[in-house]
């Protein structure tokens, strides 16, 4: 095999961004080609880039890693055996045919997306230890370029499951944001509030356009990123609209699972007298970093009528308080642990009290209705690798708890 | 091919207890949520049980509540319902069902597995 | 819980005609309705989703409409084999509720 590290490539002009974790010339064919058409390539976070050559700073297409399934070696149509140059990238709703150069050149392509789709380092290919080291650092770039861009009160969790963790555990906050619920390359926020006496839940979407997150509004307010779509809901709601933060002790405070012997159902205990510890949630919403000239907000609008809403939901969830809900028996997932703020005192929660309220629904003056998403093939999406490893040391050790 | 298959159905007394498996394949359990629905005989659908799994959450129907557990094996890619202090009424098919993007309908189900719960 | 109210419970039709099943939630469920065929010994299976989207590979005589409380399944052209049960099923909430079906016949 041979043993360049990199394949030839003339060197860009200085100042170009972004700078790309891996690029070579690549042959793709979309479901809609017909033949192979030879771009440069370059991958940057969960995007490849195509440029008509490796001169240009303009990509002329990009590709979202983001609904990412599988990769594939190919054998060419023709072919009685595997050149080692062709492979396909299977996405959620469509698939992708490259051609390379060299074994070496598709293995390293191979290596890089699962890198940044599973943040990960892949075992499983024809590499040599400098390869691996390169995609180690490129990991290590992804990790912090999500920490960068991927606030604590964003949750890989569907839309349901985002209304369960805002019920059950109120005291942590009452905004999250979650993957978009239609599978594009947006998010939606799920917030729940107090109105007239009945908690409601509302999903609203962002748009991701260009470089801009495009919360989807009465007037659609831009904003540069995640960081300042949840600042614009803050300051919105007169800071009413708290950002949803599960710290990462949380489960030492509030108690372990037992499973109960007469039935095996998981019970929640919570210690008797808990100690000087972690409070169960990070008190308040996280500072957020400053926004920059392009999300400053405009002048807050008077402190809200309960009844006025200032945004226009996709469509709201149940009005469905939190008391009398099963108690969820693991632990819930954080993409990031939250910047540590100072913890006040432990603290339970309080207890459920009184019935459960009849559900109502709110529908004051809601402006236009955006369309619930769409019911699609659900897939591993990109980035849960992160989250689904801290979530399984996190299981492990209740497990451990409860036996 | 997404593929859900059903077993642990048969056969039990009143107040018994029977474990249900659903083995998933063509897809994995990261993110959105699976539930079991059942069917009595010549009845319509009543849904038992849901598990979210980012989360872990779970949410069970008034009629199971306290006797089902619905918990769900990752690396196995297999769901469950454990089903305690069983009665007459819980005779019915037994379906798990995935749930479709971001919980909007469930797009792929089981064929199904009978619990007859008979003295 | 949000109850679903169906109806008709059952409904003789003949191959060809234009057939409309209505669904009525307790309370606004937006556009969370899904609509669901059954046949006898089968799994359900997904038709119509959000109310109106059409599930991947369900023929277009299918169709949903509604939103808020009243929702409606149309199939605009029986076929042989449309005849089944159909199920109306709110995902708004997630203490997830069926109707309790419409039996569809052949006239």
């Known amino acids: 095999m041979a043993s360049a590290l990199r394949p030839p490539r003339v060197p860009k002009p200085k100042g170009v961004l972004p700078s790309h974790y891996y690029e070579s010339f690549l042959e793709k064919k979309g479901p809609c080609d017909r033949d192979y058409k030879k771009f440069w390539a370059g991958l940057q976070g969960l995007t490849i880039y195509f440029y008509n050559s490796n001169r240009d700073f303009q990509h002329v297409e990009k590709l979202n890693l983001g609904a990412f399934e599988k990769l594939t070696d190919e054998i060419p149509w023709g072919s009685s055996r595997d050149p080692g140059t062709h492979f396909s990238l299977i996405l959620r709703d469509q698939e992708i045919k490259f051609k390379v150069e060299t074994l070496e050149c598709r293995e390293m392509w191979k290596g890089f997306i699962l890198t940044v789709v599973e943040l990960r380092v892949p075992t499983d290919l024809t590499l040599l230890p400098g390869h691996l080291y390169m995609m180690s650092e490129v990991l290590a770039k992804e990790e912090a370029r999500r920490a960068l861009e991927t606030p604590s009160c964003f949750l890989k969790v569907s839309r349901l499951e985002a209304q369960l963790l805002l019920e059950r555990y109120p005291e942590c906050g009452n905004l999250l944001l979650r993957p978009s619920g239609d599978g594009a390359d947006g998010v939606s926020v799920t917030t729940r509030q107090m109105h007239n006496g009945t908690h409601v839940v509302r999903h609203y979407k962002v748009k991701r356009e260009g470089p801009k997150y495009v919360i989807d509004v009465e007037q659609p307010f831009s904003c540069t990123s995640l960081d300042a779509v949840v600042n614009y809901f803050v300051s919105h709601t007169k800071k009413a609209l708290v950002p949803f933060l599960l710290d990462e002790d949380y489960e030492k405070v509030l108690g372990y699972v037992e499973a109960d012997k007469e039935n095996g159902e998981n019970v929640w205990v919570a210690p008797s007298a808990p100690g000087p510890g972690p409070a169960p949630c990070t008190g308040g919403p996280k500072p957020l970093s400053p926004a920059s000239s392009q999300d400053k907000l405009p002048p807050l609008p008077p402190l809200p009528n309960q009844e006025e809403n200032y945004v226009t939901p996709i469509g709201d969830g149940p009005a469905v308080d939190y008391e009398n809900q099963d108690v969820a028996s693991s632990s819930w997932p954080v993409i990031l642990k939250p910047k540590k703020l100072p913890k006040p005192p432990a603290k339970l929660p309080k207890p459920p009290v009184g019935p459960k309220p009849e559900p109502k629904v709110f529908n004051g003056g809601l402006g236009r209705k955006l369309p619930v998403s769409s019911a699609q093939p659900l897939f591993p999406t990109a980035g849960l690798a992160d989250m689904t490893a801290e979530l399984q040391k996190k299981l492990e050790k209740r497990r451990a708890l409860e036996h | 091919e997404v593929q859900l298959l059903e077993s642990g159905g048969g056969l039990v007394q009143p107040g018994g207890s029977l474990r249900l498996s659903c083995a998933a394949s063509?897809?994995?359990?990261?993110?959105?949520?699976m539930s079991w629905v059942r069917q009595a005989p010549g009845k319509g659908l009543e849904w038992v049980s849901s598990?979210?799994?980012?989360?872990?959450?779970?949410s069970y129907a008034d009629s199971v509540k306290g006797r089902f557990t619905i918990s769900r094996d990752n690396s196995k890619n297999t769901l469950y319902l454990q089903m305690n202090s069983l009665r007459a009424e819980d005779t019915a098919v037994y379906y798990c069902?995935?749930?479709?993007?971001?919980?909007?309908?469930?797009?792929?189900w089981g064929q199904g597995t009978l619990v007859t719960v008979s003295s | 819980d949000i109850q679903m109210t169906q109806s008709p419970s059952s409904l003789s039709a003949s191959v060809g005609d234009r057939v409309t099943i209505t669904c009525r939630a307790s309370?606004?469920?937006?556009?969370?309705l899904n609509w669901y065929q059954q046949k006898p010994g089968k799994a359900p299976k997904l038709l119509i989703y959000?109310?109106?989207s059409l599930q991947s590979g369900v023929p277009s005589r299918f169709s949903g409409s509604g939103s808020g409380t009243d929702f409606t399944l149309t199939i605009s052209s029986l076929q042989p084999e449309d005849f089944a049960t159909y199920y109306c099923?709110?995902?708004?909430?997630?203490?997830?509720?069926f109707g309790q079906g419409t039996k569809l016949e052949i006239k």
């Open positions: 309370q606004s469920i937006s556009s969370y």
């Open positions: 959000a109310a109106s």
């Open positions: 598990i979210y799994y980012s989360s872990g959450s779970t």
């Open positions: 099923q709110q995902v708004y909430s997630y203490l997830f509720t």
């Open positions: 069902a995935r749930h479709g993007w971001d919980d909007n309908g469930f797009d792929y």
């Open positions: 063509g897809f994995t359990f990261y993110y959105g949520g």
